[in-house]
């Protein structure tokens, strides 16, 4: 664009130089050139000459007018065609803008990873708005009143050194441009309500040998949370519904989970954990891919006889996911828990 | 390369009015962040009100918040701090600063924060 330029003269934009997309717009330009009396003013958009809607108001000064202008962005400038002179005489230009104000930022979310050292705030910020736009996350202490603003984007991470005063605070996203300004709901954050707790890692499994083999899944989390309440979820590779098992966790050893599944096939597994009777999940751990053993003997497979883990506290249920494309993508799929039966073609988040 | 000079500052009885003017030359085109910052002896700077130019929102340090008032003069490059009611503990030099470009998560009213800074005023509220 344009940023320092030496005018002969002036160019001025209504409604201004940043208005919002799909305004109609006029752009001025007034020559003060010595020793030209211009035979014709002439407008540029990017670079290249500009033919309609243009009028000469008076000797020294000319408008182009766009109906709708919908470019985020434009270069505009005007030169003077003098008599006597080979080439056009610049005498003006402006960078303009067009864009939206932006929307008020939503689902605004709070959570602090557990050995992290941060408070990290994410939301929606809508739809584009084409030009520079801040976010600024306002955080108040409900016990002293102190409030904090950190600039942001679409995320904030604030450190917890500096959240030592209170427990109990107020967080909300404002986000402002040029064209307008929009607060996000409050959002009511107790610190220790808000902890995810560390990275729970599927490490191994295996398939013993038995009559009736059973898998063994172990998994492991560095928590020092101690009552963790986790969901596994499982499948075979090839199929798109999951079976999800909930159970309690107590990581200060290794968790063993056992499992009675179909031979000779591909499972994918996946675990997440959060603290037990809080709100926020870790997300799922990475697929973690097991090939059960081959079916030894004549005992015939009876999928519908158990495949349900020997674990007290615990629940299985099943979940579709939404596509049955590239299944070794499996972090990519998602679906809704249906606790104890099957889904029925209700495809939504859960991670 | 920005140059920021403050003007405004002088004695006022406690409960009376100041206003502070910062002129500001050497921008490059694009928005800015500018505030005003205090230092009172013996006490580390702190925060009292910035803006950004782009938009029309301003924030302010706790203790200023209903009080102090921050704007501008876009055509002449001017910061202003309007202070009303003011206490014997809003003594203090002040000083404008600015900065182009903000990091992410910036405490918008930390000092270290900002690149550019004028010499200051000194503003003192008697009793």
């Known amino acids: 664009g344009i940023t320092s330029i030496n005018c002969s003269g002036d160019m001025w934009v209504e409604p201004g130089e940043i208005f919002q997309m799909g305004m109609n717009v006029s752009i001025y330009c007034q020559e003060a050139l010595k020793h030209c009396r211009p035979r014709n003013l002439y407008f540029y958009k990017n670079g290249f000459k500009e033919e309609f809607d243009i009028t000469r108001i008076n000797r020294t000064t000319a408008r182009i007018w766009y109906k709708g202008f919908s470019e985020p962005h434009a270069y505009m400038h005007c030169t003077a065609e003098c008599p006597g002179h080979f080439q056009e005489t610049l005498i003006c230009g402006k960078d303009i803008s067009s864009g939206h104000p932006p929307d008020a930022p939503s689902n605004l979310t709070c959570v602090i990873y557990e050995y992290s050292g941060n408070m990290t705030c994410t939301w929606n910020t809508g739809k584009p708005t084409y030009i520079d736009t801040k976010y600024i996350v306002h955080v108040k202490s409900l016990e002293t009143e102190e409030e904090q603003q950190y600039l942001a984007s679409s995320y904030v991470k604030i450190s917890t050194d500096s959240l030592q005063g209170s427990r109990k605070y107020l967080v909300w996203v404002q986000a402002v441009n040029s064209l307008g300004m929009e607060n996000s709901q409050q959002l009511h954050v107790h610190l220790d309500d808000i902890v995810i707790p560390s990275a729970s890692i599927i490490s191994r499994a295996e398939t013993t040998n038995d009559t009736v083999p059973k898998t063994i899944v172990y998994w492991k989390s560095k928590t020092m949370i101690e009552k963790v309440f986790c969901e596994m979820r499982y499948k075979t590779t090839t199929n798109q519904t999951w079976s999800v098992k909930e159970f309690d966790a107590n990581f200060t050893y290794v968790q063993q989970s056992e499992f009675y599944l179909e031979p000779d096939s591909k499972y994918v597994f996946q675990v997440r954990c959060q603290e037990t009777g809080k709100r926020n999940w870790q997300p799922w751990s990475s697929p973690f891919v097991h090939q059960t053993s081959q079916e030894t003997g004549k005992r015939n497979w009876q999928p519908w006889s158990s495949p349900f883990v020997h674990q007290t506290s615990q629940t299985v249920s099943q979940v579709t996911a939404k596509s049955s494309h590239e299944p070794q993508k499996m972090e990519m799929l998602s679906a809704t828990i249906f606790r104890g039966h099957p889904a029925s073609g209700n495809h939504q988040d859960i991670g | 390369q920005v140059q920021l000079q403050e003007s405004g500052g002088g004695s006022v009885q406690a409960g009376g009015s100041l206003r502070l003017s910062c002129a500001a030359s050497?921008?490059?085109?694009?928005?800015?962040?500018m505030g005003w910052f205090r230092q009172a002896p013996g006490k580390e700077r702190e925060g009292v009100a910035t803006?950004?130019?782009?938009?029309?929102?301003?924030f302010y340090g706790d203790s200023v918040k209903g009080r102090f008032t921050i704007s501008r003069d876009n055509f002449k490059n001017t910061l202003y701090l309007q202070m009303n009611s003011l206490k014997v503990e809003d003594t203090a030099m002040y000083y404008c600063a600015a900065d182009p470009a903000l990091r992410l998560g910036a405490n918008i009213l930390r000092p270290a924060e900002y690149k550019y800074w004028g010499q200051g005023t000194q503003v003192t509220v008697s009793s």
């Open positions: 803006l950004w130019t782009g938009g029309a929102s301003t």
């Open positions: 050497g921008y490059t085109s694009g928005n800015y962040w």
